[in-house]
Interface confidence: low
């Protein structure tokens, strides 16, 4: 009985090759798929007797595992069938074919191989979706998610990387970060800002060679604004006297923005200046080797009864500020506490 | 199993609008694009457009621009279909489908079709 | 837009026999680096949804029964139903996906 579509027949195939042993085809199925994996002999010629190895061990049949002279089925594969497979000429122990097998945990998307269309995947990258990549300049309003696509395939399969204006680009490159999408050859780029233009290419490649494709970005600026602060942000903390804590802050501005964090202090007993400024001393500033995700958090190492108190994220661009602030309480160790309960006295946090 | 799941059949006048929407189920709803086609009575089938749901791109068959607006909720797995300006030729079955954004591309799941009835 | 044209109309066939539905395109749907043609073939049975038989105008779609071939490259395919049932009484149409999507008229298979 054929599978239904959800547990799709997945085969892949690879031609017998000259006196040396074949390169080892990558290939990956879905968890649950039927797997196929077919060593034929160019124009139908009889191979002899065969046998098929998992990882060096002979494979038996079972009522899962099919074994048959040229042809190996693994029923409803799981994480425990992946492997290097091997078909061998059982006298001379040649080995016909070699099937690298990775077992993910989606299920195959079917891309069923028939048999005349063998190995037709195998080699350099190539583009499997040239409709999907015509718009190389891409326009959108500040604050709007970006995805760039390079849907690719080859053998083994081949690998993505990204760039910005030439350079490696990674997720700490900007605030908000990004999502890389390899299964969906994608980059996304969530609330794009200004600072997020430029020429955006996608490598990719495999030991067969390499293929790229480079994206436009440009970001329409709204009415500039202030930096936005999201919402809920730092939040109020409460710790053990000597524990770690952190503080986060998430800022989304058009133009560069720059992140201080600060600590409310009391000067001579008064915690605002004559102006009704509030006394602060800044804890952590943009300096020549941070990263805006670094300022985004504010951690606090082996905290003391002196840490407590009010915390701020301050974040600043051309056109203004914004602020969010946030309390830390202390609590004492907890043998002191119990000291204290003891002696009759009452916390109150 | 891959399910896609659509609301029910719909009368409307001309001149109306119309929001079909269509649930997915059994898959991640952001690893594919939905799109919409349409079947008129006896007749063959017709591309309206399709929408990625993780940024909400869309495309639309030229015959469909401006007209119709495919949408998607990714918190509720989601995608709607709204057509505007309806005439009596806008009568037909609407089906939504789904190509992966791997292999094959192709349209692998249907919905069961919706019917929408435009008369005055 | 690609045009897609899809040949006969409508075709009566014996049971056991074989069928020849034909769609041409506008333009090429075969993408030279990979040498793929994107072009698709779907079942519409009466008072069903389509369904996916084939893709790369010649792999089936699992669950699909042999009987069902696709050929063809570039602007001319060729979906053949090696030896025709009952259940096989349906509209077959083609469909591009190299540049949006556009489907053929439909041909409407049926037992003589």
């Known amino acids: 009985e054929p599978p239904g579509p959800e547990q799709r027949v997945v085969r892949r195939a690879a031609e017998v090759p000259g006196p040396e042993p074949s390169q080892q085809e990558q290939v990956a199925f879905g968890s649950g798929d039927t797997v196929e994996l077919s060593c034929h002999p160019p124009g139908g010629a009889p191979t002899g007797p065969t046998v098929w190895a998992k990882d060096g061990t002979g494979l038996v049949a079972s009522h899962r595992i099919l074994v048959g002279p040229q042809r190996l089925q693994v029923l409803n594969a799981s994480h425990e069938d992946a492997g290097v497979y091997s078909c061998q000429h059982r006298l001379t122990r040649r080995v016909l074919c070699h099937f690298s097998v990775r077992v993910t945990d989606a299920p195959s998307s079917g891309d069923d191989e028939d048999g005349e269309d063998v190995a037709e995947d195998t080699g350099a990258p190539y583009w499997t979706r040239p409709e999907r990549m015509d718009k190389k300049l891409l326009a959108v309003p500040a604050a709007n998610t970006v995805r760039f696509r390079c849907p690719a395939a080859g053998n083994p399969t081949p690998s993505i990387s990204w760039l910005k204006n030439g350079k490696e680009f990674r997720g700490e490159h900007r605030i908000g970060g990004i999502k890389l999408r390899h299964q969906q050859w994608s980059l996304v780029m969530e609330s794009v800002v200004p600072s997020d233009r430029g020429n955006y290419t996608c490598v990719v490649e495999n030991k067969f060679g390499s293929i790229r494709q480079t994206y436009t970005l440009d970001v329409l600026e709204r009415s500039p604004h202030r930096p936005i602060l999201q919402a809920g942000l730092p939040a109020n903390q409460t710790a053990i006297l000597g524990s770690d804590v952190e503080f986060h802050c998430k800022v989304y501005s058009d133009a560069q923005p720059h992140i201080q964090w600060l600590k409310h202090v009391e000067v001579n007993g008064s915690k605002v200046g004559p102006d009704g400024t509030p006394y602060v001393t800044v804890l952590k500033t943009a300096g020549a080797n941070t990263t805006d995700k670094e300022l985004e958090v504010l951690s606090l190492h082996n905290v003391t009864f002196e840490d407590a108190g009010e915390y701020t994220c301050l974040a600043g661009n051309s056109i203004g500020f914004s602020h969010h602030s946030a309390w830390l309480v202390v609590l004492p160790a907890e043998e002191e506490l119990m000291e204290t309960d003891e002696a009759g006295s009452v916390y109150a946090g | 199993q891959v399910q896609l799941v659509q609301s029910g059949a719909e009368v409307k006048k001309p001149g109306a609008s119309v929001k079909v929407s269509c649930k997915a189920s059994?898959?991640?709803?952001?690893?594919?694009?939905i799109h919409w086609v349409r079947q008129a009575p006896g007749q063959g089938l017709e591309w309206i457009g399709d929408?990625?749901?993780?940024?909400?791109?869309?495309s639309y068959a030229q015959k469909f621009q401006g007209r119709a607006t495919l949408t998607a909720d990714r918190s509720t797995s989601t995608a709607y279909m709204e057509l505007s300006s309806l005439r009596s030729e806008d009568t037909a079955v609407y089906y939504c489908?789904?190509?992966?954004?791997?292999?094959?591309?192709?349209?692998?799941?249907w919905g069961q079709g919706t019917l929408v009835t435009v008369s005055s | 837009d690609i045009v897609m044209t899809q040949s006969p109309d409508s075709l009566a066939v014996s049971l056991g026999e074989r069928a020849t539905i034909n769609c041409k395109s506008s333009?090429?749907?075969?993408?030279?680096?990979?040498?793929?043609?994107?072009l698709a073939w779907y079942q519409q049975k009466p008072g069903q949804s389509p369904k996916l038989l084939i893709y790369?105008?010649?792999t089936r779609e699992s669950g699909v029964p042999d009987r069902f071939s696709g050929s063809g490259s570039g602007t001319d395919f060729t979906l053949t139903i090696s030896s025709v049932q009952a259940e096989d009484v349906a509209v077959y149409y083609c469909?591009?996906?190299?540049?949006?999507?556009?489907f053929g008229g439909g041909t409407k298979v049926e037992i003589k």
């Open positions: 489908t789904r190509t992966y954004d791997g292999y094959p591309y192709a349209m692998d799941y």
């Open positions: 059994g898959d991640t709803f952001t690893d594919f694009e």
């Open positions: 929408i990625d749901p993780e940024t909400g791109s869309t």
């Open positions: 333009q090429s749907v075969l993408y030279s680096n990979n040498n793929k043609n994107y």
């Open positions: 790369w105008a010649s």
């Open positions: 469909q591009q996906y190299y540049s949006y999507r556009t």
